[in-house]
């Protein structure tokens, strides 16, 4: 239903779009899982955090991430239906002072400790690609999404409309 050109149309200006203010408009905790219900977990190893995609044992507690929503500065008024809302970007923080970062050179997703204001690599444009699923597009690299590869998170280039709803870039947010 949605062509890649449609996605690029709304995210082409990401490189020079800025965030309104320095405070998120909304924050809440949620667990992150894949389309296939594998959990995204975070483990402290050798003073750095590792990110895993794994099946949890029954009754095993899911890791939570703090989702912070930021409005882009410019209204997304290019759409045909006259939408006047501002594009939302999110940051994801599984523990204090650590945020998910897009490493575009290595095509990887990493946890970095940093101070605010956060770098652009920590911001992801939020998409509703599929019923009850979201996708995270790199602010720094339009058309590149957080995805699952070999039981790890990776950056995946989405280069055709057929790939827009590919399962490995779809994630579920759950508050339970």
């Amino acid at each position: 239903a949605f062509g890649i050109s449609g996605v690029q149309k709304y995210t082409r200006a990401l490189h020079d779009s800025s965030i309104t203010g320095i405070s998120p408009i909304t924050e809440y905790l949620a667990s992150l899982s894949t389309y296939n219900d594998q959990s995204i977990t975070f483990a402290l190893e050798d003073e750095s955090y590792e990110i895993y995609v794994e099946d949890l044992k029954k009754d095993e507690k899911k890791d939570k991430v703090l989702l912070s929503y930021y409005e882009s500065q410019h209204p997304s008024n290019e759409s045909g239906d006259g939408v006047d809302g501002k594009m939302l970007m999110v940051t994801l923080s599984p523990t204090k002072d650590f945020w998910l970062h897009a490493n575009n050179k290595e095509h990887s997703v990493e946890l970095h400790k940093c101070e605010k204001p956060l770098p652009d690599q920590a911001f992801f444009v939020l998409h509703n690609m599929h019923s009850n699923c979201v996708s995270f597009e790199c602010k720094t690299d339009p058309g590149v999404f957080i995805g699952v590869k070999d039981n790890h998170l990776a950056l995946i280039k989405v280069d055709s409309s057929e790939n827009l709803c590919t399962e490995n870039i779809l994630f579920k947010l759950s508050e339970t």
Epitope: A30, S76, G85, L88, T176
Partner: nanobody
């Protein structure tokens, strides 16, 4: 176009209650969250409460235990039940929703025009 229409504001005495409503309409495909912010004169807009599509909630510390947010997904409507109101709750209350439309997968932030809540004796 996505519209958010708030209602339920007004004048109430300290200790009293009000219930705000916000209805979203238009070419809405998916709503990620709906929430309430408020802005008192001379102050910055602040988050009051938010409810997600999965039913999770988050409240500002100043309203915990007094305010309750709820949502009717079938009507794309969010409610804010405000009890034990105080003078410092006086503000314009704005509805905010994160949603995508049928023309784009991108999630956007939409705002209502606001409804005034005045707590005074």
């Amino acid at each position: 176009e996505v519209q958010l229409v708030e209602s339920g504001g007004g004048l109430v005495q300290p200790g009293g209650s009000l219930r705000l409503s916000c209805a979203a309409s238009g070419s809405i495909r998916t709503v990620n969250y709906m929430g309430w912010h408020r802005q008192a004169p001379g102050k910055q807009r602040e988050l009051v409460a938010v409810v997600t599509s999965g039913g999770g909630t988050n409240y500002a510390d100043s309203v915990k235990g007094r305010f309750t947010i709820s949502r009717d997904d079938t009507k794309n409507t969010v409610y804010l039940q405000m009890n034990s109101l105080r003078a410092e709750d006086t503000a314009v209350y704005y509805c905010n929703a994160a949603a995508s439309t049928y023309s784009s997968t991108v999630v956007r932030s939409f705002w209502g025009q606001g409804t005034l809540v005045t707590v005074s004796s």
